[in-house]
Interface confidence: low
């Protein structure tokens, strides 16, 4: 289920899957929510630790049992991912942090009159992930009112420093507030060039696009279909970026599909989950559990309820069925995507709906029926 | 509308004109007013133009040539395109427009009632399509709102006429076997309405078709009843009251 409570002065021991710098616990929790394996997190505010390297440290954690031992640590904040928390799931983070400089690659500097304007500039710049703004009272006069637009390889700051009269924050693109607008077209038989930032396996281009949308550095993608001429590249989703923010070239290429991240859409973003079930497809991965259930939809529900499950395969092979129930293979991987996609199998595959923000959520709202 | 006739004031008070203002201003699609602040239209109207600030929505009008720079229009607060709509396919061709400011209802500007969820049992025999679209395939936008009475066609019959396309249960077709009367380019997004028990209901949203008014090529419409859950979800306000006209 959905666990929203935060644990003050507590730190989860072990289970680390990733670490980064974040300005507060809420942002750390959001990163945990969107990380494929993170179930728990611990955050170290600047006041909680003398070690400069670990200040603002956000530690993402996994656990086979779903929990880890808590140790006392003054100032630390720990909690759970919001996977399975329905419409509390959002990549939107509006907070502005005073007295904090979030470090990264500074690629644009301009003079603006307020931190809000700086945040707006970041939101309206295709490559900007976060920003820092030197206020009117910043100690060096030549830097006053400077708005620095930034990015980093992981989308989070490479360091966070306490610095007076500096204010920092994140792009509001995930809040669907970008003025850029987005290309919703999917381009059949077209391959994009430029820099690959990641490679995952997906069953179709729409899953590829959603993954691109929620990847911090993906601006566009190319997907190689299951009939692509090179067998080892079939179902490969290449997440891409470029200096300009758009593909520098596109090549007509049969059995490829390309498109853009939808992060710059002005309306709501696509849900960070994939609800479609793929008949005749087997998703390979690390086995989490095998259970007998009645029907593929129940298999998907079972995967969704088991928080560590990322995807599933429901087998219809006679040897995998007992009366009306068949084997439901609950699986996971390092990146949340299948490690192998096989076609022509007797069964169906799909993804957990744990990140669907339309999911059932009794924590924060009471549903009312329409008259 | 091919084979139609002029409408009169207040005859179709839910009909709106979706226009784009770039250098010039032109009518691109129709739409239906379903609440003080909501318009239902086709998703494909926004293909290539998803920028809400270029759109102007004219309601309570009959003649496009009456529109001047002083004619009031609504602007878009939000465009909600169905999450499963794809430009390359005809499925889920439905979009909601939230207006920046609510409209007052008058005799010339009021909403159309929506069907009940999954309405499959009602047999509609009096159905009309309206719009300012082309009056022939290679035609032009019409000044006066046109109307045409068209019978619904079963999905099985429609599928026979469109072998290359999947006619899903979430589509509804309308047309004459001999052709001659149909929606056409520029009518997209507008209403297919049917009168039943004295009440007009929005049965379809003008979506696509092979040419216009061709023999044995009916028009294909998005079946509104199949999207009631989606419409209610997207239009529900924070106090839980649906902000649109649903049947009593």
């Amino acid at each position: 289920g959905c666990l929203t409570q935060l644990y003050e002065n507590a730190f989860f021991r072990g289970g680390d899957v990733a670490s980064m710098y974040t300005p507060n616990a809420q942002y750390c929790q959001m990163r945990c929510t969107f990380h494929p394996r993170c179930l728990l997190f611990s955050f170290l505010p600047a006041s909680s630790i003398n070690d400069m390297e670990k200040r603002f440290g956000c530690f993402l954690k996994d656990s086979v049992t779903g929990t880890l031992p808590k140790v006392h640590r003054t100032g630390a904040v720990s909690g759970h991912s919001l996977k399975q928390c329905g419409h509390q799931i959002s990549a939107c983070h509006r907070d502005i942090y005073k007295g904090v400089d979030m470090r990264g690659v500074n690629f644009n500097v301009s003079k603006v009159s307020s931190v809000e304007e700086c945040q707006k500039r970041c939101t309206s710049n295709i490559r900007c992930q976060f920003f820092s703004y030197a206020t009117q009272t910043f100690h060096k006069a030549e830097y006053r009112n400077n708005c620095l637009l930034k990015y980093s390889p992981g989308g989070t700051p490479t360091a966070i420093k306490v610095l007076s009269n500096v204010e920092s924050g994140f792009s509001l693109k995930p809040c669907a507030l970008s003025e850029i607008g987005c290309h919703m077209n999917i381009f059949q038989h077209l391959a994009f060039s430029d820099v690959d930032v990641a490679r995952v396996l997906t069953p179709d281009a729409f899953v590829c696009r959603t993954i691109c949308t929620y990847h911090p550095n993906c601006l566009f993608f190319t997907f190689y279909t299951n009939v692509w001429k090179i067998e080892s590249q079939r179902n490969v989703c290449l997440l891409k970026t470029s200096e300009s923010g758009t593909p520098s070239s596109s090549t007509p290429q049969e059995n490829t599909i390309s498109g853009y991240s939808l992060l710059t859409c002005k309306r709501t973003l696509p849900e960070p989950c994939h609800s479609k079930i793929y008949p005749g497809v087997d998703f390979g991965g690390e086995e989490l559990n095998v259970t007998f259930v009645k029907g593929v939809n129940v298999c998907q529900e079972t995967c969704t309820k088991m928080i560590r499950c990322q995807f599933f395969t429901y087998s219809l092979l006679p040897e995998d069925c007992k009366e009306e129930k068949c084997k439901c293979f609950l699986r996971l991987s390092m990146d949340g995507s299948p490690t192998r996609i096989a076609y022509g199998t007797q069964g169906s595959s799909g993804y957990s709906l744990r990140l669907c923000n339309t999911g059932d959520n009794s924590v924060c709202t009471t549903k009312t029926s329409t008259r | 509308i091919v084979g139609g006739t002029n409408s009169s004031w207040g005859e179709w008070p839910w009909q709106v004109s979706l226009q784009v203002k770039l250098t010039a201003q032109r009518h691109l699609c129709g739409g239906s007013l379903i609440g003080h602040q909501w318009v239902l239209t086709a998703a494909h109207c926004f293909d290539g133009l998803p920028l809400q600030d270029v759109w102007r929505i004219y309601s309570g009008i009959l003649n496009l040539s009456d529109i001047t720079k002083d004619t009031p229009f609504s602007q878009i607060k939000e465009i909600i395109i169905h999450q499963n709509y794809k430009v390359s396919e005809g499925n889920h061709d439905i979009a909601l427009i939230k207006l920046q400011a609510p409209l007052n209802y008058t005799e010339f500007q009021k909403p159309i009632c929506l069907p009940s969820k999954g309405d499959t049992s009602t047999i509609y025999t009096n159905c009309w399509v309206t719009g300012w679209g082309f009056s022939k395939e290679k035609g032009e936008i019409q000044n006066i709102l046109q109307k045409v009475n068209i019978p619904l066609v079963t999905n099985e019959e429609c599928q026979k006429r469109y072998q290359d396309y999947k006619i899903t249960q979430r589509m509804v077709c309308a047309g004459y076997k001999e052709g001659g009367k149909d929606a056409c380019k520029g009518d997209s997004g507008g209403p297919l309405v049917c009168k039943h028990n004295g009440m007009w209901r929005l049965v379809g949203i003008t979506s696509w078709g092979e040419g216009c008014a061709r023999r044995e090529q009916p028009g294909v419409y998005t079946k509104v009843a199949e999207y009631m859950d989606w419409i209610l979800e997207k239009t529900q306000s924070s106090d839980g009251k649906a902000q649109m006209q649903s049947p009593a």
Partner: antibody
């Protein structure tokens, strides 16, 4: 009525450059994929380049890739073809055309301009 | 790339004749094929799209058939206005034209 009017053709030396324009009217230019198609004297039709409605995606025939650049200005309803490093074999009448997208798939070029002649010769 | 091969390259016929032009694709293009007519000094004119659908305003003596890799354009009764060059064009994967068939007076 749909109209496409090409201009900018003429005589140019090998290695030179030309910029062709196509002014469109009578349809919603910003919604359409636009194309350039050429026809060498006494020869058949050859697709040269295409640009998607937003202008973000461009595609080229292998014979012109790296030398020609297609672009559009939706606010001016105009399509362009910047031709660099011209060769004798680029001599042709250049047509602009458009196709409808969406459903049903009407991807044939259903409207053409009258063409503009480009001659590459020393 | 998909290649389109038209045959014959030239066809001599008389008014009233039934004329057939064939077009072969190097791989399956489903029904995504168009036929054009072009007269000297003029732009091409779309006759048929989706292999068999007649463009609005085109006389019914023109018809198209085929799918996959084999397609034909038929003129049931050749008229004086029909002497021209005809091109097929695939649009399954981008766009490729056939080399053309010139229909001339016998």
């Amino acid at each position: 009525e749909v109209q496409l009017l090409e201009s900018g053709g003429g005589l140019v030396q090998p290695g030179g450059s030309l910029r062709l324009s196509c002014a469109a009217s009578g349809f919603t230019f910003s919604h359409y994929i636009m194309m350039w198609v050429r026809q060498a004297p006494g020869k058949g039709l050859e697709w040269v380049s295409g640009i998607y409605s937003s202008g973000g995606i461009t595609v080229y025939a292998d014979s012109v890739k790296g030398r020609f650049t297609i672009s559009r200005d939706n606010s001016k309803n105009t399509l362009y073809l910047q031709m660099n490093s011209l060769r004798a074999e680029d001599t042709a009448v250049y047509y602009c055309a458009y196709r409808r997208t969406g459903i049903p798939r009407r991807d044939a070029f259903d409207s053409w301009g009258q063409g503009t002649m480009v001659t590459v010769s020393s | 790339d998909i290649q389109m091969t038209q045959s014959p390259s030239t066809l001599s016929a008389s008014v009233g004749d039934r004329v057939t032009i064939t077009c072969r694709a190097s791989q399956s293009i489903s029904s995504w094929l168009a036929w054009y007519q072009q007269k000297p000094g003029k732009a091409p004119n779309l006759l048929i799209y989706k292999a068999s659908t007649l463009e609005s305003g085109v006389p019914s003596r023109f018809s198209g058939s085929g799918s996959g890799t084999e397609f034909t354009l038929t003129i049931s009764s050749l008229q004086p206005d029909d002497f021209a060059t005809y091109y097929c064009q695939q649009y399954n994967t981008y766009w490729t034209f056939g080399q053309g068939t010139k229909v001339e007076i016998k």
